[in-house]
């Protein structure tokens, strides 16, 4: 069961697995989640001992029954793993700690303006995970204003200790905040020098990349295939870094394959999800229960379900047996990888999808789209809304793509002329604007958030939040789309859809149907040449066939500009201005949504 | 053993430059910051400026504001101090000193390791 | 910038004494001070930081106390190699200043 409270004067006897540092309990708390095997934990807050060594010290804690005797300690703060948990869990963590100091290796002394500036050093630093930054009132003269950046093996301080007069707090990678490059290419017959920090066995190399995104301190690695000469080191993930943050040497060895951590990009991309299934393989682990089931997928559901199981293997049935029923063995292990995979075995393995929900909702994989033809259909753009008012009449007037539970982005101009946001009902999930009928359940706009520099599309800024009144349930019919990667930014998409009920040409009327068109991406400096009467920004991105033909138009405004880049849809745009729709040379213009991550972030996160 | 050892003298005639070097040893260079401390015949000390031989920032004193450069080559772990449009009110012997330890935060400290000096003579 | 005036400027003691060094500062400069010594043709020698902490190899006969604008270095028993220049320092604001300098000489 999921329980979120945190339990005050309480401490959770038994159990221990790990001892790390925290500046608090809730911080503690996401450290057990994020632990292959902690379930609960008990946080020592400051007044809790009189040793200073012992304060803010996590215990991290496992139980078999999910459960710990509970005992009355004074300034002990404990609770559980949020696994247990569907919401959604996020690594990151944007608070700062006044006074405090966190430990771990000092690798850079530089001056920063403030604590926010050296956290933004920290989170494009590659090797940061965590900052003390001394403010202007530290008693040191020559220590005041410096930004020191700090690592450690686990990405959690070696200690925590009292210091008045600075503050310290986490790197914002784990935030998508980054601006560190993202290369999510894997160089095949490729194995990169420099040292291993850890290695755990992988079924692929795309499961390794995962490992090493979210392991504290690996910045790229090298995977030996299941074809790899060497028999002891087939399936092996070797997790590595190096002081400059890039491999020193490549070298060629085949069957190796090789490539970098996300963790500048790991918002939008799968990196704790491992969904899919490896046939004639056995993940070797601690056995956790044998159970008879039908079918690997069966499995997989129980394992997601157990909330110890890390991995499974499933071994089907004996044709005619047990009525179809193969064995299923749940397993876990210390580090939450198979202490060995064996191939050839008939078995077919996989992991829980119980991590799944760490990573962003916006990763999930969609139903296939359906190439060809102009109408949409249901489920294939599930971040798509369209926004109505109801004065004076009710009717459809922008698009918007959902990027949060609570959130729609959509363009500035769409607001001209609405005083308030009472007036505003969101449909989601609706393909037909058939569909709605007085009785269709909408969401209502708690809040209207327009860009302070906004004037007209035209000049740029055309970019609104819209807070809902409710949160959304994701559903395979409505569900966000990621926001591009700051990391991501030389990423050349190639495959992108604008879509919406907007007019098919200048002169006519809204869409039934939701319509998509695949439009290419145009050079701002192209652009520029097509609208030489307007100054086409860097905050802007321009699409359109040179040809003309396929367009946003009139309606369509405030809809998403959607890129499929790494499996994963990316909101690259924002439909917010054209000359005419779909003329020869005058590609549609759209607010560029990278340019705008911080502001997103910003606004939604407050 | 960690020491500062400093260039030699110099003679320079007035509205001159001189260059002064200083050449760290026996630590991390890059982790402390660097002070220049000049003293005048029979005079007593003036701190002069420091510079962070890390990221290169400086901070000088106002009355050399304009006149004073300070410089660092981390290739060599060595830091520089240039005094121009010099005078006679110049002659003195410079040191280098090394001030704080900047990948630890601690309240106090003083100028632990000192060069053995620079004497520059301004003289027509 | 923070004025730092020593006194005596010069202080007459026979070996095997205390002697005694005052400075004060214009303004508090909390216990950001350092004393240093000077013997003739030499460099400067850290004694004291953080206005009472000693620095690596200082004798214990030498002590520091005070904070805000009154410090004082307290040698408690005078040895032949302690005859020579004293300066204190501030290093709580910019520009960085040091004392006038007390000379400690024999009697």
């Known amino acids: 069961e999921c329980v979120t409270r945190l339990f005050k004067d309480i401490h959770f006897e038994g159990g221990d697995i790990a001892t790390v540092f925290t500046p608090s309990a809730k911080h503690c708390q996401v450290v057990c989640t994020h632990h292959p095997r902690c379930l609960l934990f008990t946080f020592t807050g400051e007044s809790a001992s009189e040793d200073p060594t012992q304060w803010f010290t996590c215990v991290l804690k496992d139980s078999v029954t999910e459960t710990l005797p509970r005992v009355n300690r004074t300034g002990a703060i404990s609770g559980y793993s949020f696994k247990q948990c569907s919401h959604q869990i996020s690594a990151c963590n944007k608070d700062i700690y006044v006074d405090l100091n966190m430990k771990g290796i000092n690798y850079n002394s530089s001056l920063a303006e403030s604590a926010q500036e050296c956290q933004e050093r920290c989170t494009d630093d590659v090797h940061c995970h965590f900052f003390t930054y001394a403010t202007r009132q530290f008693p040191s003269l020559e220590h005041r204003n410096i930004c020191l950046l700090k690592h450690t093996q686990t990405g959690t301080p070696t200690g925590i200790m009292k210091l008045d007069k600075v503050v310290t707090g986490f790197s914002l990678k784990s935030c998508a905040l980054s601006n560190l490059a993202c290369i999510r290419d894997v160089f095949p017959n490729t194995a990169f020098a420099d040292s291993n920090i850890d290695s755990v066995m992988a079924p692929d190399a795309f499961v390794c990349r995962r490992i090493c995104t979210h392991h504290p301190g690996c910045l790229f690695f090298t995977f030996f295939s299941q074809e790899w000469p060497k028999e002891s080191q087939r399936n092996l993930c070797l997790l590595k870094t190096s002081e400059s943050g890039l491999p020193s040497t490549r070298i060629k060895k085949s069957k190796a394959l090789s490539g970098f951590s996300l963790q500048s990009c790991r918002h939008s991309i799968p990196v704790f999800c491992h969904s899919s299934f490896y046939h004639d393989t056995d993940f070797l682990g601690e056995e956790l229960d044998i159970v008879a089931v039908k079918g690997h997928e069966a499995c997989q559901k129980l394992c997601t379900n157990a909330v110890r199981c890390q991995f499974f293997t499933y071994a089907p049935a004996q044709a005619s047996c047990n009525e179809g029923k193969g064995k299923c063995y749940l397993k876990l292990s210390s580090n939450g990888s198979p202490t060995k995979i064996l191939r050839g075995t008939g078995g077919i393995s996989g992991y829980t999808l119980r991590l799944c929900k760490m990573d962003n909702e916006c990763t999930t994989k969609i139903k296939p789209r359906i190439v060809g033809g102009t109408a949409s259909v249901r489920g294939e753009w599930p971040w798509q809304v369209t926004l109505h008012t109801t004065s004076p009449t009710q009717r459809h007037l922008c698009g918007g793509s959902i990027i949060g539970n609570q959130w729609i982005l959509t363009a500035a101009h769409c607001f001209y002329g609405v005083e308030s946001p009472k007036i505003l009902r969101v449909y989601i999930g609706i393909l037909n604007q058939s569909e709605i009928k007085e009785d269709t359940s909408f969401f209502g706009v708690q809040e209207i958030i327009i860009h302070d520099q906004y004037k007209m599309a035209e000049s740029g800024y055309d970019i609104a939040l819209l807070k809902l009144e409710t949160t959304v349930n994701y559903t395979d019919s409505q569900r966000p789309i990621c926001l591009p990667s700051k990391g991501d930014r030389n990423v050349i998409y190639t495959d992108c859809w604008v879509t919406g009920w907007g007019y098919r040409k200048l002169r006519d009327k809204i869409q039934n149907t939701l319509q998509k068109a695949k439009i290419p991406l145009v050079t701002n400096d192209e652009c520029q040449k097509r609208y030489r009467g307007h100054k086409i920004t860097h905050k802007m991105i321009c699409a359109g066939y040179r040809e003309g033909g396929k367009d946003a138009c009139k309606g369509d405004s405030g809809g998403p500009l959607s890129c499929k880049h790494n499996e994963v849809w990316h909101l690259v745009g924002i439909t917010s201005w054209g000359e005419g729709c779909a003329q020869r040379e005058r590609p549609g213009v759209y607010t560029n949504v990278l340019e705008y991550v911080d502001w997103i972030l910003e606004k939604t996160q407050a | 053993e960690v020491q500062l050892v400093q260039s030699g003298a110099e003679v320079k005639k007035p509205g001159a430059s001189v260059k002064v070097s200083c050449k760290a040893s026996?630590?991390?260079?890059?982790?402390?910051?660097m002070h220049w401390v000049r003293q005048a015949p029979g005079q007593g000390l003036e701190w002069m400026g420091i510079i962070n031989p890390s990221g290169g920032s400086t901070s000088y004193a106002q009355k050399f504001q304009g006149r004073v450069t300070m410089t660092r080559d981390t290739s060599t772990s060595t830091v520089y101090m240039e005094l121009s449009s010099l005078r006679s009110e110049d002659t003195a012997v410079y040191y280098c000193?090394?001030?704080?330890?900047?990948?630890?935060?601690?309240?106090?400290?003083?100028?632990?390791?000192w060069g053995q000096g620079t004497t520059v003579t301004v003289s027509s | 910038e923070i004025v730092m005036t020593q006194s005596p400027a010069t202080l007459s003691v026979s070996p095997g004494e205390r002697a005694t060094l005052s400075c004060r500062a214009s303004?508090?400069?909390?216990?950001?001070l350092a004393w240093y010594q000077q013997k003739p043709g030499q460099a400067p020698r850290l004694l004291i930081y953080g206005a009472s902490t000693r620095a690596t190899g200082i004798p214990a006969r030498f002590s520091g106390s005070g904070s805000g604008t009154e410090f004082t270095l307290t040698i408690s028993s005078l040895q032949s190699e302690d005859f020579a220049v004293y300066y204190c320092?501030?290093?709580?604001?910019?520009?960085?200043?040091f004392g006038g300098g007390t000379k400690v000489e024999i009697k």
């Open positions: 303004q508090s400069v909390s216990s950001n």
């Open positions: 000193a090394r001030g704080a330890y900047l990948l630890e935060l601690y309240y106090y400290y003083g100028m632990d390791v």
């Open positions: 320092q501030q290093f709580n604001d910019w520009p960085l200043t």
């Open positions: 026996g630590y991390t260079f890059t982790s402390y910051s």
